[in-house]
């Protein structure tokens, strides 16, 4: 926890943030909570970004106050107004841009005092991989595809039966730039797969880690995938 300073004769209040990551082109959340106040009109929320001249967002006297908002955030921010009274100062950021990455400060003033906490926000692209059997190939082949990643990730194959095996010699990974010229489509092909085995395609960059699993037996194919954001820590 980072405790806000007691300033100007006021007491300090506890403000808590959680480092997070935004998926470019989608909406993101910058999380911040604080000791609630009984009166909404006494609560001021200010979001700042290091290196940016104006405010990211300001909420005071029960409504948004955007006269000092920086132009790079215009029309893209909102707080959860109905949850401010219970201590939620989280910010919704629409259409996340690569340039939104950086250090943010959640700055709170209530009748109890002031407090602030910083938050590291990373931006990139990440998506769930899907693993399929490539029936067009001459041998038993698996194809792992994920539509949007940035920065360029690493791709590693693993198998339940051959744990610890290195599949780099029998796999081929390509990255295809998407139409917006930032994100890339990830395609990885694994050759010479054996039946009755579970294979995992693991895609990872410094923002997210995603895994696509496929289990191939004589009678069925089972798929499972999951995605985990990295470095989400509270402060």
């Amino acid at each position: 926890l980072i405790i806000g300073f007691g300033i100007s004769g006021r007491h300090s209040i506890t403000v808590t943030t959680v480092a997070s990551a935004g998926n470019i082109g989608e909406d993101g959340i910058l999380s911040c909570t604080f000791e609630p106040d009984i009166k909404l009109s006494d609560i001021v929320i200010q979001w700042l970004k290091e290196g940016v001249l104006g405010l990211v967002h300001e909420f005071k006297e029960g409504k948004d106050e955007l006269s000092e908002q920086d132009e790079m955030f215009r029309g893209r921010t909102a707080v959860f107004a109905d949850q401010v009274i219970v201590g939620n100062a989280s910010l919704r950021l629409k259409n996340v841009q690569l340039t939104d990455a950086g250090t943010y400060k959640c700055y709170i003033i209530t009748s109890k005092g002031k407090g602030n906490a910083n938050l590291e926000y990373k931006t990139g692209a990440f998506s769930m991989p899907e693993v399929n059997v490539d029936y067009n190939a001459s041998s038993e082949t698996l194809r792992c595809e994920a539509p949007r990643w940035f920065p360029q990730p690493t791709v590693v194959w693993a198998s339940q039966v051959d744990q610890g095996a290195n599949f780099s010699e029998v796999s081929n990974t390509s990255f295809e730039l998407n139409s917006e010229n930032v994100t890339m489509k990830v395609v990885s092909v694994l050759y010479n797969v054996t039946i009755n085995n579970t294979y995992s395609c693991m895609i990872e960059n410094d923002i997210a880690k995603a895994t696509g699993d496929i289990k191939v037996t004589e009678s069925e194919i089972k798929r499972r995938s999951h995605l985990q954001l990295l470095n989400s820590k509270a402060s």
Epitope: S8, L48, G51, L53, G54, E68, T99, Y107
Partner: antibody, heavy 118, light 106 residues
Framework: EVQLLESGGGLVQPGGSLRLSCAAS????????MKWVRQAPGKGLEWVST????????YYADSVKGRFTISRDNSKNTLYLQMNSLRAEDTAVYYC???????????WGQGTLVTVSS | DIQLTQFPSTLSASVGDRITITCRAS??????LAWYQQKPGKAPKLLIY???SLESGVPSRFSGSGSGTEFTLTISSLQPDDFATYYC????????FGQGTKVEIK
């Protein structure tokens, strides 16, 4: 470690031009607004110009508007100040500085001296 | 343009003293005010931003307060390293500096 290194200062005649550069390192340059501030010998600080991180927005003090141009090359991590139609009253140490929180400026270069004299 | 008036222009004090410098804005600037310290031949150093937030690495004997048009910088116990010139700067509408306060040894 954040470092800002100004260069390009020197002696110039009234009406002449100079281009100051500020080489930045130790931070993601394109994410931070930058500014130029000057200080005439024995005098206080005077804000000159500011640019947003992208370079898309620029601001100028009335005393230099129309004569000075701030710009940045984010691929080279460098800030510039093109100074035209220089006057004796432009004589000063010119500092570049990096924006921190709430439009304050947390890191400054060591300064470069510009002398306008005939 | 927003004008900043700083006073006193010179302040004589001794090590251990508590000193206060005032900065007055010609119109309300909310809490968009910063304080800097400058020593001869050196670049300014940021002490306080947003009127009362202490810059990282700055000793806690420095504090800022105020809002609107009236602001103060306080040094709770003056140290030998604190003898310098102090400037306030408004960041609300463009940027303007106060004329400076020189803190000298009594």
């Amino acid at each position: 470690e954040v470092q800002l290194l100004e260069s390009g200062g020197g002696l110039v005649q009234p009406g002449g031009s100079l281009r100051l550069s500020c080489a930045a390192s130790g931070f993601t340059f394109s994410s931070y607004a930058m500014k130029w501030v000057r200080q005439a010998p024995g005098k206080g600080l005077e804000w000159v110009s500011t640019t947003s991180g992208s370079g898309g927005t620029t601001y100028y003090a009335d005393s230099v508007k129309g004569r000075f141009t701030i710009s940045r090359d984010n691929s080279k991590n460098t800030l510039y100040l093109q100074m035209n139609s220089l006057r004796a009253e432009d004589t000063a140490v010119y500092y570049c500085a990096k924006a921190g929180w709430a439009a304050a400026f947390d890191y400054w270069g060591q300064g470069t001296l510009v002398t306008v004299s005939s | 343009d927003i004008q900043l008036t700083q006073f006193p222009s010179t302040l004589s004090a001794s090590v251990g003293d508590r000193i206060t410098i005032t900065c007055r804005a010609s119109q309300s600037i909310s809490d968009w005010l910063a304080w800097y310290q400058q020593k001869p031949g050196k670049a300014p150093k940021l002490l306080i931003y947003k009127a009362s937030s202490l810059e990282s690495g700055v000793p806690s004997r420095f504090s800022g307060s105020g809002s609107g048009t009236e602001f103060t910088l306080t040094i709770s116990s003056l140290q030998p390293d604190d003898f310098a010139t102090y400037y306030c700067q408004q960041c609300n509408s463009y940027w303007t500096f106060g004329q400076g306060t020189k803190v000298e040894i009594k």
